[in-house]
């Protein structure tokens, strides 16, 4: 908790790591051959930059930021990734008809830098 202390984006509004929603069809996702429903998914994903201390997931992320400043060619900046997920249920095609299947890591719920 101590590490994740920066929620102010120094790069300006909407530029740092955040939850972003994209409306996508089954065709867009390449799922049309095995998923029947929903036909459209509001895909929530994590997008944006991870400047110093911004939503740092842990001390490792802070170290990564510091070393990236010193050695940008060697150490990459922290990445914006899901901190947790919302589950989603899909109606899928099966050999015998249709079935329900739940996925617990499909949609981002919130984001952090790691």
């Amino acid at each position: 908790a101590r590490a994740r202390n920066g929620d102010h984006c120094p790069l300006g509004p909407g530029r740092c790591c955040r939850l972003h929603t994209v409306r996508a069809s089954l065709e867009d996702l390449g799922w049309a051959d095995w998923v029947l429903s929903p036909r459209e998914v509001q895909v929530t994903m994590c997008i944006g930059a991870c400047p110093s201390r911004f939503r740092a997931a842990n001390m490792h992320a802070q170290i990564k930021t510091s070393l990236h400043r010193l050695k940008p060619d060697t150490v990459p900046a922290p990445c914006c990734v899901p901190a947790s997920y919302n589950p989603m249920v899909l109606i899928q095609k099966t050999d015998t008809g249709v079935s329900l299947q739940t996925y617990d890591d499909l949609l981002a719920k919130d984001c952090h830098c790691i």
């Epitope: 429903s37 589950p87 989603m88």
Partner: antibody, heavy 119, light 110 residues
Framework: EVQLVQSGAEVKKPGESLKISCKGS????????IGWVRQMPGKGLEWMGV????????IYSPSFQGQVTISADKSISTAYLQWSSLKASDTAMYYC????????????WGQGTLVTVSS | QSVLTQPPSVSGAPGQRVTISCSGS????????VNWYQQLPGTAPKLLIY???NRPSGVPDRFSGSKSGTSASLAITGLQAEDEADYYC??????????FGGGTKLTVLG
């Protein structure tokens, strides 16, 4: 305002057929799945099945497979639950419910339809 | 017999805090989510908590949900007379799809 309005109470005899309805309004009916839930007198909730009104794909709980039929008519934003031959043990309150966006929970419920089967 | 196990009844005095447990297994709560519904006497169920700990708009913050391992719980603080109702947990099970707990009757004393 999202609303699910169910048809009125029914009293039937064993062996008779029945079709009850659930009309959705205040939202895009084809964008959300509809589920049916049974509550027998003094008992808990039991999931019966789900339908995607846009493609009429249906999936049933193993406990209700072959016992009931779930259907929908998207032109009138209505889902249905039907029996071809009722039994006394079908006496219960039946609720339709709309699934939330991710298909994992029921965010709006109908008022329920009480079905009584008695000779 | 429900896949998810809840106590049949709990009670508390106005203003108190009560919790309702929901016990499952590794094939349901253990790997997935839990939702909670409130059913006031003579009415349809109403969504109270979804995806473990999220409240729909309009639900007071006196209601909160949590999940740990294969169990979940619903906490109600500042108990009020109008909270007297049946409460159901609901999850997903790999064999039965959507499953409910057997329900817990909450009685507000006094």
């Amino acid at each position: 305002e999202v609303q699910l309005v169910q048809s009125g109470a029914e009293v039937k005899k064993p062996g008779e057929s029945l079709k009850i309805s659930c009309k959705g309004s205040g939202y895009s009916f084809t964008s959300y799945w509809i589920g049916w839930v049974r509550q027998m007198p003094g008992k808990g909730l039991e999931w019966m099945g789900v339908i995607d009104p846009s493609g009429s794909y249906t999936i049933y709980s193993p406990s209700f497979q072959g016992q009931v039929t779930i259907s929908a008519d998207k032109s009138i934003s209505t889902a249905y639950l039907q029996w071809s031959s009722l039994k006394a043990s079908d006496t219960a309150m039946y609720y339709c419910a709309r699934y939330g966006r991710y298909g994992t929970y029921f965010d709006y419920w109908g008022q329920g339809t009480l079905v009584t089967v008695s000779s | 017999q429900s896949v998810l196990t809840q106590p049949p009844s709990v009670s508390g005095a106005p203003g108190q805090r009560v919790t309702i447990s929901c016990s499952g297994s590794s094939s349901n709560i253990g790997v997935l989510y839990v939702n909670w519904y409130q059913q006031l006497p003579g009415t349809a169920p109403k969504l109270l908590i979804y995806s473990n700990d999220n409240r729909p708009s309009g639900v007071p913050d006196r209601f909160s949900g949590s999940k740990s391992g294969t169990s979940a719980s619903l906490a109600i603080t500042g108990l009020q007379a109008e909270d007297e109702a049946d409460y159901y947990c609901q999850s997903w099970d790999s064999s039965s799809n959507y499953v409910f707990g057997g329900g817990t009757k909450l009685t507000v004393l006094g």
